[in-house]
Interface confidence: low
């Protein structure tokens, strides 16, 4: 499909100056950032971006890659590097270290510094790094954490725990050496190592004790508490503060987030991981946009201002799966959260960042026509005369080979939210990447956000913005609409 | 690996608090640009400017990813959105219209709106669309172009041609028909269209008649001449300018950009494109980076500034082999070069702008050590019980089945020169991939480099930096050093 | 923790048939490869055959046409139907099962306790 108004070089000139003409007008807005809001696209590489762009500009009836995102709107761009101490390709622990506690650590490793080591209990203390969250909370702020994955999960978790594996969502998934040395599993941290005032997401199971039916799914033991301490970790969170409420659906979300008696808020919409955007029961469940809306009503409300964590976090579960239909619905539903929260504040006093923690062996080729679908096939045949997908993996479970040869694919197939993607490389589950990923930045001091830096620079340009620990000689204007 | 110093937070602490403060240092450089250089990594995504980053750091003892290219040192970056009007994946043809014309095109058409279409003659008139280098010729500046591709390439072309085909190098890739409408083959088209002050490249046989010997290979006839019309193009080129010079080798190349009588300057140095880095001659051939130096020195003289394209033509050619060898050495290549124009130039009055006209569907993957090499193999072994690369292709030549199943592989295998990764999907050459590219920036202007922009922006980022049209009512005081 | 558990083994005479089958119980995740290990007495385990659950299979070269795996996803069982059985074949045989760390807790490889084959006239 050739647009016939593209046809016309007059569309892409005017296009052009009207772009410069906005990019003479930037001007950077210089006060401090009252608020403070970093959007997370786990495995959002910009391999994803551009995929994801084309998906919701043909869901909203346009050929796909001319129709910005949320994303796209944001004025000042970097690209981060994303490597760990020890792997030139991280995962999503070492990475959460980096971007919210400002300092790159190892492997499968949370809040440590690079002088822990996976699995070592005894390398926890004194390696500790302190999150941009933490800082936020200690300066009167107040905080949340929103993700589509268990709220202890690797990413949310770096906004709160220290510990050297990732893996240790409950007491249940911890050797006992490990416990009986004084090492604490992360959804104990997630109550007691700092007052956070919104949770949201999913892990009900690391919060309950081992066999205490779910209240979703009480006739399946596999989604029963998991805790060996049998501690019911809910309970004791709510009994730290008079206006906590807890709420496991998306009904009890809509009324406490409505309910100004309510000043902490946990909300677990599943035992583990919340289900799939395209799984989602919308009665049952909020999506990450009604997530991301609940928290800011709520912590908008503190004159001091706040520190909001939002995590698309199953775009990379997607991908580790080789389903690309996965990823990329997950990464449209995770950029309208975008959109929401630009709805909701203000750019004047709100620094809002939205980068990825790394990237995926996911790629988007072949020569497809304009506005074909991104799910479809590449125009023409591959060398073994069968069809193939504009869209593959370097590695991952999509490789598959049929009576020794690689499978032929159809349109309709290719279309389907189960297809897995063909991949070079057959592995369990597909792999992160480690190339570049991008930073987009809005808001007071985003202008810092600039050139090609270390991952860890994000929690910095945080931290600086809204004259936190340890810049709080910032030497910035107060926020826009604050008397100091 | 793990550095100890980086175990230590202050490490990146110390790092990031630096890095902020050359952030707030940035100051726009609000004058015109006197020059313009843009460097084009044809097929330089984002994975193949990490991967370079590593290559590049290991070639120089470091562990890789930490250590910064030349081109991580420009200050400015945004995203380039690559579409062409036609396809979601583009070619170098329609991509090299937008950055250096301003205006998106079609598939396999040069210097063309989109009204044009592909290998229809009668579509060109009345469609042509003026490049910025042909501006900054009318505009009394000295113009340019490097590339490691033959001159007459899709992307080089961008810069002087209009055709509907790019596969037209000389008359005999046309059809009868096509020359019989008056359509011009791009070598024609190089010294008839406007006056540029340096060729450097390759391209040879697309000059001379056929049957020509190549100066370089007299033996070879399938390196000799190739035009139909019994032309030589060089002789005429060489007709038009009184301090015009043709070479064919480094030595005269070196000879002559030291030769104050020499105003115009030619070099082809092979009959198609130029060697690959790893195969190169340096008796005979210069490397992009002495190309890149020669044309600087013949263009600085002017005091009206002058345009320059130099294009790391072969980085595409590495990726479409499926060889990422070649592709990396290559994009390393292209970054000494851009260290070099940076030592020759000053930030204050040439504004720099590195960019890629598409990616390839090539990814970095599997977790491997930190310091590991970049061609190594992945830890572990894959769901065969084989090894596989941390390097991987969606598509390409690289998938092979040995006996119905894929091939193992070694360390020593995989770092040859000659090793093809793996793929997907079997395709005599690997593909381009579709998501947005990185343009970095320096200099006058450069601050307009932001955001997310359609690809045919940086066209008239470079237009308005230096004034050009449409932009002569730019408002601009003038560059640094000059008197107007 | 994930158990597995081995069944089918037995004596059996050259040309003779057997099917083994292993359970998987536990947390598994849905994304993983179950194979065959065999060990000989003094040498080393060596791959038999694996089934992904993607559905691509691998077997050693020295059992090819007389072997075929195949697994059950909902049940989390993987089946080796031997045919053709040699004494050559005579070996303890491991069930293994392979889950990926990335999503999931828990180690990389789990092994069955092994059931023992015997080719002998």
């Known amino acids: 499909i050739i647009p016939v108004e593209e046809e016309n070089p007059d569309f892409w000139n005017r296009q052009a100056a009207e772009a410069l003409g906005a990019a003479k007008k930037l001007q950077p807005i210089q006060t401090a950032a009252k608020n403070l809001i970093i959007f997370l696209g786990d495995g959002m590489g910009v391999s994803t971006v551009t995929a994801a762009r084309i998906l919701k500009g043909q869901k909203e009836e346009k050929l796909g890659p001319e129709t910005p995102l949320a994303m796209d709107h944001f004025p000042y761009v970097a690209l981060s590097k994303t490597y760990s101490v020890d792997k030139h390709v991280p995962d999503s622990a070492a990475t959460a270290t980096a971007y919210l506690c400002g300092v790159k650590g190892n492997f499968q490793t949370i809040g440590l510094s690079a002088a822990a080591r996976y699995n070592q209990c005894n390398t926890t203390r004194g390696n500790e790094v302190v999150s941009v969250m933490n800082r936020a909370k200690k300066a009167g702020k107040s905080v949340g954490v929103v993700t589509t994955t268990r709220v202890q999960h690797a990413s949310p978790a770096g906004a709160y725990a220290h510990t050297v594996n990732r893996n240790w969502y409950s007491d249940a998934n911890m050797p006992g050496s490990a416990r009986r040395e004084g090492c604490k599993d992360i959804a104990t941290q997630l109550i007691s190592n700092m007052d956070i005032d919104v949770i949201l997401g999913g892990g009900r199971k690391y919060m309950f004790r081992m066999g205490a039916p779910d209240p979703e799914y009480p006739h399946d033991y596999s989604q029963d508490g998991t805790r060996m301490d049998g501690k019911n970790l809910v309970q004791e969170w709510l009994a730290k503060h008079q206006g906590a409420r807890y709420v496991w659906n998306r009904t009890e979300l809509m009324q406490a987030s409505l309910d100004p008696s309510v000043t902490h808020l946990m909300g677990l919409f599943e035992p583990g991981d919340m289900k799939y955007e395209i799984h989602r029961d919308p009665t049952l469940d909020p999506s990450l946009m009604e997530m991301t809306e609940a928290a800011l009503r709520l912590l908008s409300r503190n004159p001091r201002g706040f520190f909001l964590f939002v995590e698309g976090g199953r775009i990379d579960h997607g991908h580790h799966e080789s389903r690309a239909y996965r990823a990329l619905t997950e990464a449209v539903m995770f950029d309208d959260a975008i959109e929401r929260a630009g709805q909701l504040t203000s750019e004047e006093d709100t620094l809002t960042l939205v980068t990825a923690d790394h990237s995926h062996v996911f790629s988007f080729g072949a020569y497809p026509l304009r506005g074909s679908s991104i799910f479809g096939l590449a125009p023409g045949k591959a060398q073994d005369r069968k069809a193939y997908t504009a869209l593959l993996y370097g590695n991952g479970p999509g490789y598959v080979l049929k009576d020794g040869a690689r499978p032929d694919v159809t349109e309709s197939e290719s279309g389907s939210p189960e297809y897995r993607q063909q991949a070079a490389v057959p592995l369990d589950e597909e792999t992160h990447a480690g190339e570049d990923v991008a930073v987009f930045a809005r808001g007071p001091q985003a202008h810092l956000v600039h050139g090609v830096q270390e991952q860890s620079f994000v929690a910095h340009v945080m931290a600086f913005a809204a004259c936190l620990e340890p810049y709080t000689a910032c030497d910035l204007a107060p926020p826009a609409g604050t008397t100091d | 690996i793990i550095p100890v110093e980086e175990e230590n937070p202050d490490f990146w602490n110390r790092q990031a608090a630096e890095a902020l403060g050359a952030a707030k240092k940035l100051q726009p450089i609000q004058t015109a640009a006197k020059n313009l250089i843009i460097f084009l990594g044809d097929g330089m995504g984002v994975s193949t400017v990490t991967a370079a980053r590593i290559l590049k750091g290991q070639k120089e003892e470091k562990l890789g990813p930490e250590t910064p290219l030349a081109m991580d040192h420009f200050p400015y970056v945004a995203l380039s959105k690559t579409y062409s009007v036609d396809k979601h994946v583009p070619d170098s043809a329609a991509t090299a219209t937008a950055y250096l014309c301003g205006v998106k095109g079609n598939f396999q058409t040069i210097g063309l709106s989109a009204a044009a279409r592909y290998n229809q003659c009668n579509t060109t008139r009345g469609n042509e669309v003026v490049s910025v280098m042909n501006r900054a010729k009318k505009a009394g500046k000295s113009v340019g172009v490097v590339t490691t591709t033959r001159v007459q390439h899709a992307s080089p072309a961008g810069a002087y041609a209009h055709t509907v085909n790019r596969n037209w190098y000389s008359d005999a890739n046309m059809p009868g028909s096509a020359r019989r409408e008056g359509c011009k083959d791009i070598a024609t088209q190089l010294i008839s269209n406007m006056d540029i002050d340096v060729i450097l490249g390759g391209g040879r046989k697309y000059m001379f008649r056929m049957g020509a010997p190549d100066p370089e290979y007299p033996h070879d006839y399938s390196q000799d001449g190739t035009r139909m019309d019994g032309k030589n193009l060089v002789q005429e080129w060489l007709a038009k300018h009184q301090g015009a010079r043709y070479v064919w080798n480094r030595t005269e190349l070196m000879q002559a950009s030291l030769d104050p009588s020499v105003t115009h300057l030619m070099g082809l140095f092979e009959p198609g494109d130029m060697k690959y880095e790893i195969h190169r001659d340096p008796t005979l051939d210069p490397s992009l980076m002495e190309m890149t130096e020669a044309a600087l020195r013949l263009l600085s003289r002017n005091p009206r500034g002058f345009f320059l394209f130099v294009e790391g033509g072969r980085i595409d050619h590495g990726h479409h082999e499926s060889r990422a060898y070649r592709a990396l050495t290559e994009a390393v290549m292209f970054d000494d070069a851009i260290e070099r124009a940076g030592q020759l130039t000053s930030e204050e009055d040439t504004l720099t702008l590195v960019t890629a006209d598409h990616s390839h569907v090539f990814s970095f993957g599997a977790y491997p050590l930190r310091g590991s090499s970049i061609f190594g193999l992945a830890p572990g072994k894959a769901q065969d019980r084989k090894a596989y690369t941390a390097l991987l292709y969606g598509n390409g030549p690289g998938y092979v089945l040995k006996d119905g199943a894929r091939p193992d592989v070694t360390e020593s295998e995989s770092g040859s020169p000659e090793y093809r990764q793996q793929a997907a999907v079997p395709l005599d050459e690997e593909t381009h991939a579709g998501e947005d590219v990185a343009v970095f920036a320096r200099g006058p202007q450069a601050h307009l480099v932001h955001g997310v922009q359609e690809q045919s922006f940086v066209a008239h980022v470079m237009a308005f930096a230096a004034c050009l049209e449409p932009y002569t009512a730019c408002d601009l005081a003038p560059p640094a050093g000059t008197t107007d | 923790q994930v158990q597995l558990v081995e069944s089918g083994g037995g004596l059996v005479q050259p040309g003779g048939s057997l099917r083994l089958s292993c359970a998987a119980s536990?947390?598994?995740?849905?994304?993983?490869?179950m194979g065959w290990y065999r060990q000989a007495p003094g040498k080393q385990r060596d791959l038999v055959a694996v089934?992904?659950?993607?559905?691509?299979?691998h077997y050693a070269d020295s059992v090819k046409g007389r072997f075929t795996i195949s697994r059950d996803n909902a049940k989390n069982t993987v089946y080796l139907q031997m045919n053709s059985l040699k004494p050559e074949d005579t070996a303890v045989y491991y069930c293994?099962?392979?889950?990926?760390?990335?999503?999931?807790?828990?180690?990389?490889?789990?092994w069955g306790q092994g059931t023992k084959v015997t080719v002998s006239s």
């Open positions: 089934a992904t659950s993607g559905g691509t299979i």
């Open positions: 293994n099962l392979v889950v990926p760390y990335g999503m999931i807790a828990g180690d990389h490889d789990y």
């Open positions: 536990g947390s598994i995740f849905s994304v993983n490869t």
